[in-house]
């Protein structure tokens, strides 16, 4: 008799998930010495004792935590990169300014980036048919759970100036609903961190607009100052000269506003 | 919730071109931070790398296939495209469109980390 398998409503786990969680492991412990001693089997057995043999809608931050522990790392708390709704242009720029760091930059949020995971509750599969949808199904799945808990975790190790690249060419550039508005937000530390700085990123060629005085960017002040954090804002009118002018900033043309 | 999707005929006669198109979704190809490729995989054998291509323009070929490859980029479709000439029923395999991890060089099967669900093109007339 076939067993009954939940269906949900988002994509299943990415193909040959436990092979790729291993190689990007490897991979990113060979260059970063810092992490060396890193044992990427220890690795992927935290990962899968994560949400294997878990209902895949009961996923809690503590089912995390030894795989936190394994690959806790420090990065400069004064050089970290907070992004919303405009991930490649965030790690185009730190793959130049290879002294900032994303989440992604992390060995956690490097092996996980861009991958979709799930189990199911008392059988030790991984479901590649499908995993819960944020919205249509619930939000403590494995891979929410994990990047909120990444997230905060993030968030809280900042401090100094914190930058954040924001996408101009949305609606909303500041989202309270993204994981940037209602997790990283909240979870800087006033005692730590002095200053935010928005950096807005512009899509159009010819938008001379100042996108700092968007009503939601007057909102993530208003946010942002009521935790006693001062807040600044950039427009970053031309990305591709921005990313330029990081590789080169000696460059004549890199005077003039971008 | 990147996704790479392989379209193009799954029968190709010998002697013709095999071309097939894998179409990105979710994340673009021309952010200079990955590398695209394509692997296959004959029946009951292992994967055999094809060829990689970045953003750049920059192309990388399987020395064994090298005369007969061609990959290719469109990014105002967000797709890269393979074309293997002069197919013989050895060809016949499941092709695989693939993405390789951030700030790696890809050139071999191990090296890709994002997979399409990949399609099965048989060489036969």
């Known amino acids: 008799v076939p067993r009954w398998r939940q269906q949900w409503s988002g994509p299943g786990t990415t193909k040959r998930f436990p092979e790729t969680v291993l190689a990007r492991c490897v991979k990113y412990t060979e260059i970063h010495p810092e992490m060396r001693h890193v044992d990427c089997q220890s690795v992927w057995d935290a990962f899968k004792g994560a949400f294997i043999s878990k209902h895949p809608c009961n996923i809690t931050e503590e089912d995390y935590q030894p795989l936190m522990k394994l690959g806790t790392q420090t990065v400069p708390c004064n050089k970290i990169l907070l992004w919303s709704r405009i991930k490649d242009l965030a790690h185009q720029f730190t793959q130049v300014q290879r002294d900032m760091f994303t989440l992604e930059d992390t060995l956690l949020g490097y092996l996980a980036d861009d991958l979709t995971w799930c189990g199911e509750f008392n059988t030790s599969k991984i479901n590649y048919q499908s995993c819960p949808d944020w919205r249509k199904d619930c939000s403590n799945n494995p891979v929410s759970v994990f990047w909120k808990t990444v997230s905060r975790r993030f968030a809280e190790a900042a401090c100094d100036v914190v930058h954040v690249m924001l996408n101009g060419s949305r609606s909303k550039i500041f989202d309270k609903n993204s994981t940037f508005g209602s997790v990283e937000v909240h979870n800087l530390q006033p005692e730590k961190v002095q200053t935010l700085e928005a950096w807005v990123i512009h899509g159009g060629r010819e938008d001379s607009r100042d996108l700092c005085q968007d009503p939601t960017i007057k909102e993530l002040e208003s946010i942002i100052s009521k935790r006693n954090i001062q807040f600044s804002c950039k427009n970053i009118y031309r990305p591709d000269k921005f990313l330029q002018c990081v590789k080169n900033p000696e460059d004549s043309s890199c005077t003039s506003e971008i | 919730q990147l996704q790479l999707q392989e379209s193009g005929p799954g029968l190709v006669k010998p002697s013709e071109t095999l071309s097939l198109t894998c179409t990105v979704s979710?994340?673009?190809?021309?952010?200079?931070?990955?590398?695209w490729g394509w692997i296959r995989q004959p029946p009951g054998k292992g994967l055999e790398w094809i060829g990689s291509i970045h953003d750049s323009g920059s192309t990388y070929y399987n020395p064994s296939l090298k005369s007969r490859v061609t990959i290719s980029a469109d990014t105002s479709k967000n797709q890269f495209s393979l074309k293997l000439n002069s197919v013989t029923a050895t060809d016949t395999a499941e092709y695989y469109c693939?993405?390789?991890?951030?700030?790696?060089?890809?050139?071999?099967?191990?090296?890709?980390?994002?997979w399409g669900q990949g399609t099965l093109v048989t060489v036969s007339s």
């Open positions: 979710g994340g673009s190809i021309s952010s200079s931070l990955f590398y």
């Open positions: 693939a993405r390789g991890p951030r700030g790696f060089y890809s050139s071999g099967p191990d090296d890709f980390d994002i």
